[in-house]
């Protein structure tokens, strides 16, 4: 990992190497001061590779509501508004960092878990699977 | 918040309500059992609204490395290759959370972040801006 | 050897249910996606359903919409067609067969066929 | 809903002949169009895909041409065991799996 010069104003650890168990302060810092939510709010109507969002709720995980992308239709939608089939839409999917509790119920510890989300769909050109 | 029972096998917590301090362990536990990474990684070249990847790396940050999608075009690729530009290729974006050291550089103590990535392109329909 | 081997055919009543089987092998099935397609003693080839490799796509005909569903079982390199509410119109050759798309998506085209299970659907 | 509409319904030919059968569209399915063989008794086999290309494994024989409506499958030199039923499907629109009726190609 990368050497990183120890502050002499950080919390005691004993730990030397990399953590495996660290502090994290809740208080969210949001860096997001120059995005226009309302911006993207309707590209999951307007696509030409429509979504619908599900909500994905579980207490015992933070953040604890995930929306979820689901694809609309199998194919794209052309201008006409009719659905072309020898497209795709697919979901862009994320790996995003979440904290469960563990053990579970506890309200101040953790566990970091990578979750793969549904962030949206797009429309591919489908290809042929070439058997070798 | 909601109310969680508390478990009498919890780390110690002199923090009666919602913790603004945790303890995080950082083994990722990797929940992405079932999905096979090959199958979204050519999207961004197959998309009718293709995308490049950039990588955006602080050592600060937890995960250190982010992957950026940039839309490839203003316009959507059509079927014979060309750029429609009566369409509109733009990013899907989505919230994520990061952990922050802080104090800087200190290794066992971080902040909780929320960053705005874009995941991918899709490809909209224009919509005209009715001025009341 | 590559192949698809359908089963769990025979003769229902109508408004019955069947559980038709499709067992496929010499092949990594979750590389594609899955298909049934019918045809009627004498008659076309006619679609029933298809699904995409993680079951995330899922599409089927007008005429069995809402009483078939087809399922896919990656850990058992099978797929599955539930047929609920059956008619006499459904009495057919079911097959199943394989997408030629490549990372398990959609192309619509057919590339392996099994050889087929009867349904036959009379009082 | 596209219709595919295939003709002759039956084509009474010798070996050696040259098979032109026909597939037309009740619209425009682009080159999006395919075309099987099924014998009898027997699982239909995949010849043409996206109106032209030839499918794995098959013979030089079989070409495919057309697009929008109208679309042919030709065998340049009939053999024995091209004596079969042929079809033609189409993946543009909804249903993306449509099927043409058939042509039956018959030893004459």
């Known amino acids: 990992g990368i050497a990183i010069p120890r502050n002499s104003g950080c919390p005691n650890s004993e730990d030397k190497n990399f953590p495996r168990t660290v502090m994290v302060n809740l208080n969210i810092h949001n860096r997001n001061t120059s995005t226009n939510p309302k911006r993207s709010s309707d590209y999951y109507n307007r696509s030409t590779s429509p979504w619908n969002l599900h909500r994905n709720e579980d207490p015992e995980r933070y953040p604890s509501v995930i929306w979820e992308a689901k694809c609309r239709h199998l194919g794209c939608v052309k201008a006409d508004g009719n659905v072309d089939y020898h497209m795709n839409s697919v979901p862009i999917q994320q790996e995003i960092l979440v904290l469960r509790r563990e053990p579970r119920h506890c309200p101040n510890s953790f566990r970091l878990e990578k979750i793969l989300v549904s962030v949206g769909c797009t429309c591919v050109t489908p290809i042929v699977h070439h058997v070798a | 918040g909601i109310a969680i029972p508390r478990n009498s096998g919890c780390p110690n917590s002199e923090d009666k309500n919602f913790p603004r301090t945790v303890m995080v362990n950082l083994n990722i536990h990797n929940r992405n059992t079932s999905t096979n990474p090959k199958r979204s990684s050519d999207y961004y070249n197959r998309s009718t609204s293709p995308w490049n990847l950039h990588r955006n790396e602080d050592p600060e940050r937890y995960p250190s490395v982010i992957w950026e999608a940039k839309c490839r075009h203003l316009g959507c690729v059509k079927a014979d290759g060309n750029v429609d530009y009566h369409m509109n290729s733009v990013p899907i974006q989505q919230e994520i959370l990061v952990l922050r050291r802080e104090p800087r550089h200190c290794p066992n103590s971080f902040r909780l972040e929320k960053i705005l990535v874009s995941v991918g392109c899709t490809c909209v329909t224009p919509i005209v801006h009715h001025v009341a | 050897e590559v192949q698809l081997v359908e089963s769990g055919g025979g003769l229902v009543q109508p408004g019955r249910s069947l559980r038709l089987s499709c067992a496929a092998s010499?092949?990594?099935?979750?590389?594609?996606?899955m298909h049934w397609v019918r045809q009627a003693p004498g008659k076309g080839l006619e679609w029933v359903s298809g699904i995409n490799w993680n079951s995330g796509g899922i599409g089927y005909a007008d005429s069995v919409k809402g009483r078939f569903t087809i399922s896919r079982d990656n850990a058992k390199n099978s797929l599955y067609l539930q047929m609920n509410s059956l008619r006499a119109e459904d009495t057919a050759l079911y097959y199943c067969a394989r997408d030629m798309g490549g990372f398990g998506e959609f192309y619509w085209n057919f590339g392996l066929w099994g050889r087929g299970t009867l349904v036959t659907v009379s009082s | 809903e596209i219709v595919l509409t295939q003709s002759p319904a039956t084509l009474s030919l010798s070996p050696g002949e040259r098979a032109t059968l026909s597939c037309r569209a009740s619209q425009s399915v682009r080159s999006y169009l395919a075309w099987y063989q099924q014998k009898p008794g027997q699982a239909p086999r995949l010849l043409i895909y996206?109106?032209?290309n030839r499918a794995t494994g098959i013979p030089a024989r079989f070409s495919g041409s057309g697009s929008g409506t109208d679309f042919t499958l030709t065998i340049s030199s009939l053999e024995p065991e091209d004596f079969a039923v042929y079809y033609c499907q189409q993946r543009s629109n909804w249903p993306p799996a449509t099927f043409g009726g058939g042509t039956k190609v018959e030893i004459k």
């Open positions: 010499g092949f990594t099935f979750d590389d594609y996606a």
């Open positions: 996206d109106a032209s």
